[in-house]
């Protein structure tokens, strides 16, 4: 996160760290807890690393440096990448992770509510992006979970800024015209959440951007509302009755 500040314990209890353990262990992506056994993240996090065994998912943590060999983590039972995601494109950058064992909810580990299907009418004015990613383009992973308040940008405006790309209706953009605040490398897959009527909703999944926090180059996020049918279909077909956090 560029231009962000430290988060507090329990402030973003749905945020998880997706880490890979090969010779060493490192944080690669963020994700959002959406049910006892489900994490929503970006499909591109698994490019070149599709093996479930190498992944460790840490939930209910604030500081990555607190992780030791004794820190509990979740393992992956199943990775479900959107069927239309292609490595050669930037579309449908969404994936579900089914955990091997369900998580108990606590003050520091609980799910984020999902938006309503095709939610286009809600005007979100209080949106935040969180993650342990770089704090500048050529930076490094941060120890303490960072947060930053970023306004949403219309798709029309976003398309103007990214003429070489196709900004689809299944994407949502956020950023300041002057730059300075944005997601960055390592924040991929993490949440863009917005507070509406006193409730936090998962509006976007951190996907891509041209550099980080550059002027007139907003961050691009997978629009979760556009994938509600897919999320429900996959979570319900996998375990019969899904326990998802949908808005009231």
């Amino acid at each position: 996160i560029v231009g962000g500040t430290n988060s507090s314990w329990g402030e973003w209890p749905w945020q998880v760290s997706l880490q890979v353990k090969l010779t060493a262990q490192r944080h690669l992506c963020g994700g959002s807890l959406i049910g006892h056994q489900w994490v929503l993240t970006a499909a591109h996090c698994f490019d070149g690393l599709p093996l479930q065994d190498v992944w460790r998912i840490y939930s209910g943590i604030l500081n990555l440096s607190d992780i030791t060999k004794d820190t509990p983590f979740s393992q992956i039972k199943e990775i479900i990448i959107h069927q239309n995601y292609k490595v050669s494109e930037g579309n449908h950058d969404i994936a579900l992770i089914k955990l091997q064992a369900p998580l108990n909810y606590t003050e520091f580990q609980k799910p984020i509510c999902l938006p309503s299907k095709g939610d286009t009418s809600t005007i979100y004015t209080n949106c935040w992006v969180t993650g342990w990613g770089f704090s500048k383009e050529k930076g490094e992973i941060q120890n303490i979970l960072q947060k930053v308040n970023i306004p949403l940008v219309t798709n029309e405006e976003c398309q103007k800024r990214y003429q070489d790309y196709k900004i689809t209706q299944r994407m949502v953009c956020a950023g300041y015209k002057e730059g300075g605040k944005d997601a960055c490398k390592g924040d991929s897959g993490g949440p863009l959440v917005c507070k509406h009527n006193g409730m936090w909703r998962l509006v976007g999944i951190t996907s891509w951007g041209e550099g980080c926090a550059r002027r007139e180059q907003p961050g691009v996020y997978t629009k979760v509302a556009e994938y509600m049918d897919w999320i429900l279909e996959k979570t319900q077909s996998s375990d019969g009755k899904a326990q998802m956090q949908s808005p009231a």
Partner: antibody, heavy 125, light 108 residues
Framework: EVQLLESGGGLVQPGGSLRLSCAAS????????MTWVRQAPGKGLEWVSY????????IYADSVKGRFTISRDNSKNTLYLQMNSLRAEDTAVYYC??????????????????WGQGTLVTVSS | DIQMTQSPGTLSLSPGERATLSCRTS???????LAWYQQTPGQAPRLLIY???SRATGIPDRFSGTGYGTDFTLTISRLEPEDYGTYYC?????????FGQGTRVEIK
């Protein structure tokens, strides 16, 4: 299966014009940036131009700027290169290629993942 | 413009040998925008490596790419008869997109 098929090459006199076409199939053409690359006989590869998915944004190499125009018709899945004021140094095999733009570590990637077989343009009197 | 300099110009090696091809750029190039292509006589170029180190679909694992910033390398661990040809590096980090002049790998 992704396929790109160029046509329209041939022999043309200096100062003349030619229009190359590239018919695309096997993928959603309107989602991809497309490009032209050329190769003079016995020489290396030279990038010529690219066009955005919508066709609204185009970029050219200095060597062809003002003389060549890239365009596309997404309804026909076809890419074009209109070449005017041709010179002897424009003699080359012209390839159209698809530009893949995936995502890696929250940044976009860019590479030419599929190429046509090429069409030869000879500029000579 | 970003200049791409490949070395050596020609590499004469026997089948089974290791080939190391270098590509130097005149300015910093984001690894995501660095690719390698193979071209055999009379054929269109074929993508080998993208993002400096990711193998394209169907490319054997004897091909590997490494590098960062201004120094990139393509390695063929054990040359096979079909690997002979010309190899190009290319950047699309900034326009104009540029290719190296190529390295020809020939049979010794």
């Amino acid at each position: 299966e992704v396929q790109l098929l160029e046509s329209g090459g041939g022999l043309v006199q200096p100062g003349g014009s030619l229009r190359l076409s590239c018919a695309a199939s096997g993928f959603t053409f309107s989602h991809y940036l497309m490009t032209w690359v050329r190769q003079a006989p016995g020489k290396g590869l030279e990038w010529v131009s690219y066009i955005s998915p919508s066709g609204g944004h185009t970029i050219y190499a200095d060597s062809v700027k003002g003389r060549f125009t890239i365009s596309r018709d997404n309804s026909k899945n076809t890419l074009y290169l209109q070449m005017n004021s041709l010179r002897a140094e424009d003699t080359a095999v012209y390839y159209c290629a698809r530009v893949a733009r995936g995502i890696a570590a929250r940044s976009r990637t860019s590479y030419l993942d599929f190429w046509g077989q090429g069409t030869l343009v000879t500029v000579s009197s | 413009d970003i200049q791409m300099t490949q070395s050596p110009g020609t590499l004469s090696l026997s089948p089974g040998e290791r080939a190391t091809l270098s590509c130097r750029t005149s300015q910093f190039v984001n690894s995501n925008y660095l690719a390698w292509y193979q071209q055999t006589p009379g054929q269109a170029p074929r993508l080998l490596i993208y993002g400096a180190s990711s193998r394209a679909t169907g490319i054997p694992d004897r091909f590997s790419g490494t590098g960062y910033g201004t120094d990139f390398t393509l390695t063929i661990s054990r040359l096979e008869p079909e690997d002979y040809g010309t190899y190009y590096c290319q950047q699309s980090s900034r326009t104009p997109w540029t290719f190296g002049q190529g390295t020809r790998v020939e049979i010794k």
